[in-house]
């Protein structure tokens, strides 16, 4: 585990002609801050992997406000570092991207408005506990000059931060082969396991079941001498010892490839293959065109015809980021309508869609009462991908089929007793109750809650709903 | 600037095999998606199929007309990449363009390939 | 596969004039949507992608517009050099498609 540290030293105009006007105004005062987002040495090509060794963002810088007519200067910066902490080890090579943010403080609706300035990127090599690296890069007419490195949290030491380091057991000294913890010399390096049958006096680990070999040694557990196995490709001078060539300095020792390259032999010298956005003869010259193929997953990129021009990447469907390396989850906005199953396959998006719907998104309702007949007189009703039938009275079940019992539901009020009938329902009311449902109370004068009866129907006579 | 070139083309009989190149220059070949798409005598333009990159296992995709007849490599080495066509049919008579990411932005000046017995 | 039909299939115009190129896809392509230009012998060229943005160094006079299924391309005063086959592509769903192509021809 440790941190990886950035530090912004400016942020301004590059060298050249073509300044950048100033980002800020006195109409629109703004204010910078700064995202640094990393990955491991290889993530670079890999979508899936975000800023998979962290992120962070700066805090916001002091307000600046243009003067009229002066030249954008080096723009006032926030305090302090940007730290990414790392939980596993420190890769070695790793990715960066350092975006610049303006925050313009005018008179926005719904607060500050957030614009991306610059965005520099590129690949390193660092070891961890080393001193600080400077750098300067270019995004455009801007120029960003920074420094950063890793460092470890203790109890870890290394170059990776794998090592581990505890408290001495002993006042004095470390215990045989493990060394005092720079910079706590009061503690001592913790043995590490290495790979079992490791050599113990020409073979180390820095990770748990490795073995790595002290130089003159080779072979899985560093048990063979270099001069044994090496007879067969002499280079460099004779071994006294032996009469066998042992290898001597070559070019690719120390690797000249700058900025994460990898190095390999020619017969006359070496080869550099530069990362992304690095070129010439040691991977030395930085600055991404078009040309570089900065943009990810097929992303199409546009402007960046010269170093000094920012490029921006058009993403295919379902990658997004600034340079296409994120991968989207498209069924999280929900595109398949009316319930349907989403389904992301990488180059295209499906859904499958439920009973009644169809179209790419679901978004057709099929006709559910076509073909569909309602018995004994009941209508059809399309509706939510199934149809429903509106039945005739004394018919229910969902075609219609079933005879209802228009009593199941007991509609006689005040417990009047109901009678099945050809045309619906009849209540016969309890003394004292009236209305086709037993709900009017007859007043004990014997008026009625309700006009006069009609001829030839008595309170109290059952009434017959119509 | 930005180049590819196009070779391989000729006139085959059906149920023949053809080997098509393309050989860019001017941009890191390594990073881009390659694209095959052709155009057949006074027709429009139809994708043929891509190949991705190392990182992608150098994934391949093709037309459903030529699943299983045509094959798409890559040499980053030699910044080339080739085409593959067996079981050739008279209906497989076009221009072959190769053309590059998935908005095919650069184009080569394409091949002739005729299949006619 | 998703479908575009490019109308009309061939527009007969004068240089100076307006010309105005349809392209309507079978489902919504969103604005995944490019134009390309192709002249006799040549190889195509992209004009615009996203629908409505120009590619590197495409003239102004080039200009696109719509979403979903509707597409249009602008050539608000044609060029000499402007006279071509213009073919629309989607770039949506795998596999990409294209249009059958307009030809514009000097009247």
């Known amino acids: 585990a440790g941190v990886f540290e950035l530090q912004i030293h400016s942020f301004g105009p590059g060298p050249g002609p073509g300044a950048p006007r100033s980002p800020c105004s006195a109409r629109l005062p703004c204010r910078l801050f700064f995202r640094v987002c990393l990955k491991p040495g290889l993530s670079e090509e890999a979508a899936e992997s975000p800023c998979a060794l962290g992120a962070a963002l700066s805090a916001r810088g002091p307000v600046y406000t243009e003067q009229p007519g002066a030249p954008a200067p080096d723009l006032p910066l926030p305090d302090g570092l940007l730290q990414v902490p790392f939980r596993d080890a420190w890769p070695g090579t790793f990715s960066f991207i350092i975006e610049t943010w303006r925050e313009e403080l005018g008179d926005q609706i719904g607060g500050p408005a957030w614009s991306l300035l610059a965005r520099v990127a590129g690949r390193r090599r660092l070891a961890a506990g080393g001193p600080w690296a400077r750098d300067i890069q270019r995004a455009g007419a801007w120029e960003l000059r920074f420094s950063y490195r890793a460092r470890c949290e203790p109890p870890a030491v290394g170059t990776a931060c794998t090592r581990l380091c505890r408290p001495r057991s002993a006042p004095s000294r470390c215990g045989p082969g493990l060394r005092p913890c720079a910079p706590l010399e009061d503690e001592c390096e913790a043995p590490l396991v290495c790979r079992a049958g490791c050599s113990p006096e020409h073979g180390f680990c820095e990770q748990p079941g490795e073995c790595r070999c002290l130089e003159g040694w080779t072979g899985p557990l560093c048990t063979v001498p270099v001069s044994t196995s090496s007879c067969l490709s002499p280079r460099g001078p004779s071994s006294a010892t032996t009469g066998c060539l042992v290898p001597g300095p070559g070019p690719c020792d120390g690797n000249p490839c700058a900025n994460g390259g990898s190095c390999s032999e020619t017969p006359r010298s070496f080869e550099c293959t530069c990362p992304r956005g690095f070129y010439g003869l040691r991977c030395e010259v930085s600055g991404v065109t078009c040309a570089d193929g900065p943009c990810f997953n097929g992303g199409l990129c546009v402007g960046g015809a010269d170093p000094d021009s920012a490029y921006i990447c058009h993403c295919p469907p379902g990658f997004q980021g600034s340079n296409c390396e994120k991968r989207v989850d498209r069924c999280s906005l929900q595109p398949c309508r009316n319930g349907g199953l989403c389904l992301d396959l990488g180059h295209a998006l499906r859904c499958r869609c439920r009973a009644g719907f169809a179209g790419p998104r679901c978004e057709h309702d099929l006709d559910d009462c076509a073909g569909r007949a309602c018995a004994n007189g009941g209508t059809c009703v399309e509706g939510g991908g199934a149809h429903r039938c509106s039945c005739a009275l004394g018919f229910g079940g969902r075609d219609c089929r079933e005879r209802a019992d228009p009593c199941a539901a007991r509609p006689c009020a005040h417990g009047g007793r109901c009678y099945a009938h050809f045309s619906g329902l009849v209540c016969a009311c309890a003394p004292g109750y009236m209305g086709a449902r037993c709900e009017f109370p007859v007043h004990p004068d014997g008026a009625s809650a309700l006009p006069a009866a009609p001829p030839g129907l008595r309170p109290g006579d059952p009434q017959r709903y119509l | 600037e930005v180049q590819l070139v196009e070779s391989g083309g000729g006139l085959v009989k059906p149920g023949g095999s053809l080997r098509l190149s393309c050989a860019a220059s001017g941009i890191t070949f390594s990073n881009f998606w390659m694209n095959w798409v052709r155009q057949a005598p006074e027709k429009g333009l139809e994708w043929v199929g891509q190949i991705r990159l190392k990182s992608d296992q150098y994934a391949t995709h093709y037309a459903e007309s030529v699943k299983g007849r045509f094959t798409i490599s890559r040499e980053d080495s030699k910044n080339t990449v080739y085409l593959q066509m067996n079981s050739l049919k008279t209906e497989d008579t076009a221009v072959y363009y190769c053309t590059t990411g998935y908005y095919f932005d650069y184009w080569g000046q394409g091949t002739t390939v005729t299949v006619s017995s | 596969n998703i479908v575009l039909t490019q109308s009309p299939a061939t527009l007969s115009l004068s240089p100076g004039e307006r010309a105005t190129l349809s392209c309507k896809a079978s489902e919504n392509v969103g604005t995944y949507v490019s134009w390309f230009q192709q002249k006799p012998g040549q190889s195509p060229r992209l004009l615009i992608y996203g629908a409505s943005n120009r590619y590197t160094g495409i003239p102004a006079r080039f200009s696109g517009s719509g979403s979903g299924t509707d597409f249009t391309l602008t050539i608000s005063s044609l060029e000499p050099e402007d006279f071509a086959v213009y073919y629309c592509?989607?770039?949506?769903?795998?596999?990409?498609?294209f249009g059958g192509g307009t030809k514009v021809e000097i009247k």
């Open positions: 592509g989607q770039f949506y769903s795998f596999p990409s498609t």
